[in-house]
Interface confidence: low
């Protein structure tokens, strides 16, 4: 999916008002320095591409993020403010429903959500130069 035509300001507002708090809640109990950021993004469409991938695509050691509060809100924000996004996700969501068994918070998931926090922060500061 091409995120170029999303309403970035509306998505940013949704992140600041609610998604960010859900990410903090998920990460509660971990130190902010515990994980190194290994994923980055260069502009807002790129950031949303990475955010969507890390949030909804199961990875080795972490297959359980899609039903978390922050993921549900991320999905809603993308579906509302990215034209045509929801249609592209129908098949992927159905496949995920079949695969998912139970919710387990692993260290790998915590690391993944830490990466997500970094991507969202970058999404909110699109004019900053890359380090």
């Amino acid at each position: 999916y091409d995120f170029t035509n999303c309403d970035f300001e509306k998505i940013k507002a949704a992140y600041l008002s609610t998604i960010s708090k859900d990410l903090i809640t998920y990460m509660s109990g971990t130190k902010s320095t515990e994980f190194n950021n290994t994923v980055s993004c260069s502009n807002r469409p790129h950031c949303l591409t990475e955010i969507q991938s890390l949030t909804f695509n199961p990875t080795a050691g972490c297959a359980s993020l899609a039903k978390e509060m922050f993921a549900m809100k991320t999905k809603a924000a993308l579906a509302i403010w990215c034209p045509g996004y929801s249609e592209t996700q129908i098949n992927a969501t159905q496949a995920m429903k079949k695969r998912r068994k139970r919710k387990v918070t692993t260290n790998k998931c915590l690391e993944q959500v830490s990466q997500l926090q970094g991507l969202w922060r970058r999404f909110n500061r699109p004019l900053l130069k890359q380090q």
């Epitope: 008002s17 609610t18 859900d22 549900m72 809603a76 579906a79 509302i80 929801s86």
Partner: antibody
């Protein structure tokens, strides 16, 4: 079973602050959201805002500067405060429970009529 | 903001007839976020259909919902006297909540 009950002053003067209470039973506010919806006499439904289980809130963009939703989990009570009231805020105010994390309101209170008049 | 427009504003039909109520979104939305409510005078709204086509608990199967993208429909296959009420469509996503202006279904 799930129940919601609104209570409030009934009559409020213009420019004053409205304080409403929604007392819930049959579920816990620690892991469920509660939303406020209003309906002016003879008109349609207007969503005002929501407070989620974790305490995070979302507000109607046109009312965000006038509206505060809070809660006391231990008292199973959700509060709505709206300041700078005007005549057009006259409405029946409902609290409603979203089904999980969604905008699906499966349970509603009976509503409380608030009249803004001097 | 996404705006939901319902049509017609008022629908006059007789018991036994078929009712078709429309809800149009100003931009495309996921079918997961479109819901319908029924409201009778002096009563709270009642959830009728959620996620476009799923009947809420206790709702008779003469009610059905369909649609995708920007156009959604609530159909009552055979009107009963108790079906005459106001119907609202709603965009409810957990981030955004918007109601249509309502369609009044009245007895002809």
């Amino acid at each position: 079973q799930v129940q919601l009950q609104e209570s409030g002053p009934g009559l409020v003067k213009p420019s004053q602050t409205l304080s409403l209470t929604c007392t819930v039973s049959g579920f816990s506010l620690t892991n469920s959201g509660v939303s406020w919806v209003r309906q002016p006499p003879g008109k349609g439904l207007e969503w005002l805002g929501v407070i989620w289980g974790d305490g995070s809130t979302n507000y109607h963009s046109a009312l965000i500067s006038r509206l505060t939703i809070s809660k006391d989990n231990s008292k199973s009570t959700v509060y709505l405060q709206m300041n700078s009231l005007r005549a057009e805020d006259t409405a029946v105010y409902y609290c409603a429970k979203p089904d999980g994390y969604s905008g699906i309101f499966a349970y509603w209170g009976q509503g409380t009529l608030v009249t803004v008049s001097s | 903001e996404i705006v939901l427009t319902q049509s017609p504003g008022t629908l006059s039909l007789s018991p036994g007839e078929r009712a078709t109520l429309s809800c149009s979104a100003s931009s495309s939305i996921s079918s997961n976020y479109l819901h319908w409510y029924q409201q009778k005078p002096g009563q709270s709204p009642r959830l009728l259909i959620y996620r476009t086509s799923n009947l809420a608990s206790g709702v008779p199967d003469r009610f059905s919902g369909s649609g995708s993208g920007t156009d959604f429909t609530l159909t009552i296959s055979r009107l009963e006297p108790e079906d005459f009420a106001v119907y609202y469509c709603q965009l409810g996503s957990g981030i955004l909540f918007t109601f249509g202006q309502g369609t009044k279904l009245e007895i002809k």
